[in-house]
Interface confidence: low
C-alpha cells in the first residue's frame, strides 16, 4: 500500500503525492494532525473552524489536533456535505453545506447521527475523481471499523481498522470475490483513537483508491475489481457513531 500521491497530482498528473501536505499527503493540512499510534489527539490545538464550515458546535476536545474541530450534531435541518476543513482533497471552489441531493456538489446521507451499519448507495458506481467522505466518532473501547465498497455480493475494497488484533492496532484491506477473501494488505499506521472524532476520505483514482484519515494520507489500494461502475454501494459498519456519509466529484 503505497502512500505517494497528492490531490494536485491526481488532478494534474504532476506526480505530487501530497498537496496541502495531506499534511501531509493530500490536501491542505499536515498529515500528522493528531494521532498515529502512540500519539494522542493533542487537546491543546482546538483551532477554529472557518465560519460556516461546520454547522453545529464542536464538543470540547473534539479532535482539535486536526485542522478544524469536527462538529457535534449539526444544527437542526442542516445537511452538511464533506467537511470543508483542511481536507486532504480540497474540492474546487468553495465547499458548502448542501442538501442531501443538491443539483451539484456533495451527494449523500443527511447529517446524522446515522444508523450503523449504514449503506450509502453509489448510483452508477464509482468513477475516478469521486471523493467519498465519512464523518463520525469512534466509540469508546472500539474493536473495529469497516468500510465495504460492494459490487453485488463481492467486496471490491474492504477497509478494516482493527483496534486490538493480538494487542496491536492494524488496518487490513482486502477484496472478496465469489465469497473468497484475497490477499490482505496491512497498514500499521493507525490514525483512529477510541472516543475520538474522525474523517475518512476515499478518493477514487483510475487504478486505485486513496484513503486519507483526518486529512492525512494513509494508504492506497489498487483496484482488484475493475468494473468500477458496478461498485454501487458503500457499507459502513463497526464501532462508530456515524455523523455523515457523502460523496462528490472533484
Amino acid at each position: 500500500m503505497a502512500d505517494n500521491f497528492s490531490l494536485h497530482d491526481a488532478l494534474s498528473g504532476s506526480g505530487n503525492p501530497n498537496p496541502q501536505g495531506w499534511p501531509g499527503a493530500w490536501g491542505n493540512q499536515p498529515a500528522g494532525a493528531g494521532g498515529y499510534p502512540g500519539a494522542s489527539y493533542p487537546g491543546a490545538y482546538p483551532g477554529q473552524a472557518p465560519p460556516g464550515a461546520y454547522p453545529g458546535q464542536a464538543p470540547p476536545g473534539a479532535y482539535p489536533g486536526a485542522p478544524g474541530a469536527y462538529p457535534g450534531a449539526p444544527a437542526p435541518g442542516v445537511y452538511p456535505g464533506p467537511p470543508s476543513g483542511p481536507g486532504a482533497y480540497p474540492s474546487s471552489g468553495q465547499p458548502s453545506a448542501t442538501g442531501a441531493y443538491p443539483a451539484t456538489g456533495p451527494y449523500g446521507a443527511p447529517a446524522g447521527p446515522l444508523i450503523v451499519p449504514y449503506n450509502l448507495p453509489l448510483p452508477g458506481g464509482v468513477v475516478p475523481r469521486m471523493l467519498i467522505t465519512i464523518l463520525g466518532t469512534v466509540k469508546p473501547n472500539a474493536n473495529r471499523i469497516a468500510l465495504d465498497f460492494q459490487r453485488g455480493n463481492d467486496v471490491a475494497f474492504h477497509f478494516n481498522p482493527r483496534f486490538n488484533e493480538n494487542n496491536r492496532r492494524v488496518i487490513v484491506c482486502n477484496t472478496k470475490l465469489d465469497n473468497n477473501w484475497g490477499r490482505e494488505e496491512r497498514q500499521s499506521v493507525f490514525p483512529f483513537e477510541s472516543g475520538k472524532p474522525f474523517k475518512i476520505q476515499v478518493l477514487v483514482e483510475p487504478d486505485h483508491f486513496k484513503v486519507a484519515v483526518n486529512d492525512a494520507h494513509l494508504l492506497q489500494y489498487n483496484h482488484r475489481v475493475k468494473k468500477l461502475n458496478e461498485i454501487s454501494k458503500l457499507g459502513i459498519s463497526g464501532d462508530i457513531d456515524l455523523t455523515s456519509a457523502s460523496y462528490t466529484m472533484i
Epitope: G24, G34, G38, A53, G65, P67, G68, P86, H217
Partner: antibody, heavy 119, light 107 residues
Framework: QIQLVQSGPEVKKPGETVKISCKAS????????MNWVKQAPGKGLKWMGW????????TYTDDFKGRFAFSLETSASTAYLQINNLKNEDTATYFC????????????WGQGTSVTVSS | EIKMNQSPSSLSASLGDTITITCHAS??????LSWYQQKPGNIPKLLIY???NLHTGVPSRFSGSGSGTGFTLTISSLQPEDIATYYC?????????FGGGTKLELK
C-alpha cells in the same frame, strides 16, 4: 520553481506590532498548508503552527497562542504572521515554510524575516 | 508533546568521512520524520522526508533510516558544502517538534 519570499527585517519597540509577509510562487498556493517557524538568535527551530491555505484556518501551538496571528491573502498567494504587543523574547528570525507531500515535512522555506525588539 | 533528542549536539569530521547523526523520539512516530540542513546564516532545507526518502535535488550521499523512535541521518564522503547544522523534526502529531540540532564542523 517554487519560491517563498518574505518581507524585510523589522526593528520594533516592546508593545508594538509587526506583520511579516510570505509570498509564494511556483505552485498552487491553496494546495499546501503554510507553516511558521521561529529561530531565536543562536538557537534551534521552533514550530509555531500553520495555516490551512484552503480554508484559512490557523493552528497555533501553545507557546504561540494569543499574541500571534496567521492570516492569508489568497488572491496574492501570500501568508502573513502578525505579532502583537511585542516582547524582547520575540527577537528572532521567522520563517514561513510550506508543507510538502508527506506527513509533517516542510519542503520549501522562505529566506526568513529578522525581527528585533528593543527599547 | 513529543520530544526529539538529537545527538551529538556537535560533531567534528574530516572531508571524505562518513558521519552519523541520531534522533530519538520520546514516543512512536512511525516514519514521520524529516531531516533539515541549515548552513550558517542560511535557511533550513529539507533533506529527507518520511525517514528515508531523499528530497528533490539532495545528493545521494545523504541517507536516512529508522522508524518508531530511533532514526539516523548518514552523510557518506563528507564534502565542504555539508558543513551545517542538521535538525530532525517529527510529523507524527501536533505540535510538530524539532530536535535541538547537530552542528557539523570540519576537523
Amino acid at each position: 520553481q517554487i519560491q517563498l519570499v518574505q518581507s524585510g527585517p523589522e526593528v520594533k519597540k516592546p508593545g508594538e506590532t509587526v506583520k511579516i509577509s510570505c509570498k509564494a510562487s511556483g505552485y498552487i498556493f491553496t494546495n499546501y498548508g503554510m507553516n511558521w517557524v521561529k529561530q531565536a538568535p543562536g538557537k534551534g527551530l521552533k514550530w509555531m503552527g500553520w495555516i490551512n491555505t484552503y480554508t484559512g484556518e490557523p493552528t497555533y501551538t501553545d507557546d504561540f497562542k494569543g499574541r500571534f496571528a496567521f492570516s492569508l491573502e489568497t488572491s496574492a498567494s501570500t501568508a502573513y504572521l502578525q505579532i502583537n504587543n511585542l516582547k524582547n523574547e520575540d527577537t528572532a528570525t521567522y520563517f514561513c515554510a510550506k508543507f510538502g507531500n508527506y506527513v509533517g515535512a516542510m519542503d520549501y522555506w522562505g529566506q526568513g524575516t529578522s525581527v528585533t525588539v528593543s527599547s | 508533546e513529543i520530544k526529539m533528542n538529537q545527538s551529538p549536539s556537535s560533531l567534528s569530521a574530516s572531508l571524505g568521512d562518513t558521519i552519523t547523526i541520531t534522533c530519538h523520539a520520546s514516543q512512536n512516530i512511525n516514519v514521520w520524520l524529516s531531516w533539515y540542513q541549515q548552513k550558517p546564516g542560511n535557511i533550513p532545507k529539507l533533506l529527507i522526508y518520511k525517514a528515508s526518502n531523499l528530497h528533490t535535488g539532495v545528493p545521494s550521499r545523504f541517507s536516512g533510516s529508522g522508524s518508531g523512535t530511533g532514526f539516523t541521518l548518514t552523510i557518506s564522503s563528507l564534502q565542504p558544502e555539508d558543513i551545517a547544522t542538521y535538525y530532525c523534526q517529527q510529523g507524527q502529531s501536533y505540535p510538530y517538534t524539532f530536535g535541538g540540532g547537530t552542528k557539523l564542523e570540519l576537523k
